[in-house]
Interface confidence: medium
Amino acid sequence: FKVATPYSLYVCPEGQNVTLTCRLLGPVDKGHDVTFYKTWYRSSRGEVQTCSERRPIRNLTFQDLHLHHGGHQAANTSHDLAQRHGLESASDHHGNFSITMRNLTLLDSGLYCCLVVEIRHHHSEHRVHGAMELQVQAGKGSGSTCMASNEQDSDSITAA
């Protein structure tokens, strides 16, 4: 399987909410001994490899934000985590895997990485990640929304 990032750039005004998304592509083994570890973290564009450094998102580590479940199963982190830190990670039946960040501030700007690890109890392992940039802009009216785009494309859409 692979991980796709539908959008590589999200531009949002302060105070808005944004949902960053990764998508699991390709065949996913649904065997009883196969599970998936999915998580999010902040990183930097390393010279050698993007996403190799793992930093917390709003003081929550990748361990705090992880989901662990089988195949294309729905899962999400609990609401008390979302309420306390304005974060919620979720995974649906279609391979979409997201983190929602509420009430954005300028400090939320940066590179975000999703990580998916296929666990087969050590008979094999497969690990993939995706990266996307979040730019939070000051002074925009509260009515404006986030824009999501691929940096290389001129097209952009309004993000949910």
Epitope: T61, H68, S78, D80, I119, H122, S124, E125, R127
Partner: antibody, heavy 120, light 112 residues
Framework: EVQLQQSGPELEKPGASVKISCKAS????????MNWVKQNNGKSLEWIGN????????TYNQKFKGKATLTVDKSSSTAYMQLKSLTSEDSAVYYC?????????????WGAGTTVTVSS | DVVMTQTPLSLPVSLGDQASISCRSS???????????LHWYLQKPGQSPKLLIY???NRFSGVPDRFSGSGSGTDFTLKISRVEAEDLGVYFC?????????FGGGTKLEIK
Amino acid sequence: EVQLQQSGPELEKPGASVKISCKASGYSFTGSNMNWVKQNNGKSLEWIGNIDPYYGYTTYNQKFKGKATLTVDKSSSTAYMQLKSLTSEDSAVYYCARDYDYALGYFDVWGAGTTVTVSS
Amino acid sequence: DVVMTQTPLSLPVSLGDQASISCRSSQSLVHSNGNTYLHWYLQKPGQSPKLLIYKVSNRFSGVPDRFSGSGSGTDFTLKISRVEAEDLGVYFCSQSTHVPYTFGGGTKLEIK
């Protein structure tokens, strides 16, 4: 057979540093976090931290930050822990232990332990 | 850090008896994703710890079914239905819901 082979006992003087090794065999070394655990006098266990051998990413118990440094050599499937500025408090048995499920924190394979003795 | 408190410290039993070890955490071990990362290990004299039970009640492969784990939130129990000689040693509970991972102080299972 999955094994973690640890280096032999160490006798060090106070203030010195020591580097102990843990060689993995029988499985994909980069597939799971490698953890290090300290045991004093055969009593309680303390988690020092872990390292993701794939990325080299480390997570430390705050208590051991500045004391322990975790590294890996992927080419030889070996994890290392360096302990610096040794004192008698560091005399203990140190275990490496593999995470059973990547990074979920339960350890199915343990090394035999390396005894570190700090004495002048 | 999460403090794990095990009781009793020492548990004298007769072979064939049932044994029960309690582990209490200073805060809930329910992870935000709904899982509870509470585990049990057995360390025999002169050996490394061995994983018995993971995530409260899942027996690790090769562990006899006389071992069972239960509990939720902050209170957990390991039961051995019929103690055999090979079960003697020190039992540790451990949590990996919160970093740093922490262990209980151990319960020594010994012959009466």
